[in-house]
């Protein structure tokens, strides 16, 4: 499956939007940092099958969409930027979904990748729990925003590796 050229441009735009969502200087939030235990192994493509990678990427973007579409995120972040961000993520999801459809005939059911998808979901649960514990403070949002930028950039790298394997 060939992801369209617009897909990587969309990734870049999503990262820029995330960067623009900053509401407080991270220099002021150093004490609030937290290790969310990003599931790095799910993004290392040593034995990765393409369909598995696409499923993991899809889950990553879906969970990012869920995280940023809560009423708490709307209250804490710029709504115009959020709306643009949703559009980019929605496009990413559509691109990946059409890829999954093409790959399904080649490889067995995505149930094979349940562990990988579960690891991504648990990662986002840890992020949500952190925000709740920190009462959705501006520094907590800054920590989460920076974390999502980092994980998003790692998932972009995986997509680049997939493309180079084609």
């Amino acid at each position: 499956c060939d992801l369209p050229q617009t897909h990587s441009l969309g990734n870049r735009r999503a990262l820029i939007l995330l960067a623009q969502m900053r509401r407080i200087s991270p220099f002021s939030c150093l004490k609030d940092r937290h290790d969310f235990e990003f599931p790095q192994e799910e993004f290392d493509d040593k034995q990765f099958q393409k369909a598995q990678a696409i499923s993991v990427l899809h889950e990553m973007i879906q969970q990012t969409f869920n995280l940023f579409s809560t009423k708490d995120s709307s209250a804490a972040l710029d709504e115009t930027l959020l709306d643009e961000f949703y559009i980019e993520l929605d496009q990413q999801l559509n691109d990946l979904e059409s890829c999954v459809m093409q790959e399904v005939g080649v490889i067995e059911s995505p149930l094979m990748y349940e562990d990988s998808i579960l690891a991504v979901r648990k990662y986002f649960q840890r992020i949500t729990l952190y925000l709740t514990e920190k009462k959705y403070s501006s520094c907590a949002w800054e920590v989460v925003r920076a974390e999502i930028m980092r994980s998003f950039s790692l998932s972009i790298n995986l997509q680049k590796r997939l493309k180079s394997k084609e």
Epitope: S25, C29, L30, R33
Partner: antibody, heavy 121, light 107 residues
């Protein structure tokens, strides 16, 4: 690869100001933090403050508050540090240092070559 | 502000020696400690971050340990290019602060 190129050495009179530039290449300029660190002759390292270009607002060490201004120009990928009301004890090598992209600004991953500022009457 | 105190301020050692430098923070900084190497006339270079993580491209003879207030940088077998000044730096909170440095000289 990542490179930070600073402006040349300066000799200034006490009471005047100096503005040092730091041109960055490699990575997305707007999305990482740049700090300024100084080192007086034979002395240790001292963090003055830092900025994230896309955010715009700088953070300063209390010691330099009111005397230092850190800015960034995204169009030229250049950061600036201006220090006013110079005194002899401001004689030092001034470094710009870049923090890792998408990370919290906690470690100095890349450094400029340094700019010697001499304050003398 | 968090004060960082390094010891010793200087030491003499020979090639092949095991060298240990310590850094103490005035309050707990978890594992938010970095180590740098600086040679005369050059900018500092990051060696270790988050107390014990080796920066990419740094030889494995360098290692870091500790958490809370007490930290250690160890060079397992000193090489000629390791003669330099070493600084610790806390990144727990702003202002980011450095130790006063430890100069490693040839015996």
């Amino acid at each position: 690869q990542v490179q930070l190129v600073q402006s040349g050495a300066e000799v200034k009179k006490p009471g005047s100001s100096v503005k040092v530039s730091c041109k960055a290449s490699g990575g997305t300029f707007s999305s990482y933090a740049i700090s300024w660190v100084r080192q007086a002759p034979g002395q240790g390292l001292e963090w003055m403050g830092g900025i994230i270009p896309i955010f715009g607002t700088a953070n300063y060490a209390q010691k330099f508050q009111g005397r230092v201004t850190i800015t960034a120009d995204e169009s030229t990928s250049t950061a600036y540090m201006e220090l006013s009301s110079l005194r002899s004890e401001d004689t030092a090598v001034y470094y710009c240092a870049r923090h890792l992209e998408y990370a919290f600004p906690d470690k100095f991953d890349y450094w400029g070559q340094g700019t010697l500022v001499t304050v003398s009457s | 502000d968090i004060q960082m105190t390094q010891s010793p301020s200087s030491l003499s050692a020979s090639v092949g020696d095991r060298v240990t430098i310590t850094c103490r923070a005035s309050q707990s900084i978890s594992s938010y400690l970095n180590w740098y190497q600086q040679k005369p006339g050059k900018a500092p270079k990051l060696l270790i971050y988050f107390a014990s993580s080796l920066q990419s491209g740094v030889p494995s003879r360098f290692s870091g340990s500790g958490s809370g207030t007490d930290f250690t940088l160890t060079i397992s077998s000193l090489q000629p290019e390791d003669f330099a000044t070493y600084y610790c730096q806390q990144s727990y909170s702003t202002p980011l602060t450095f130790g006063q440095g430890t100069k490693v000289e040839i015996k």
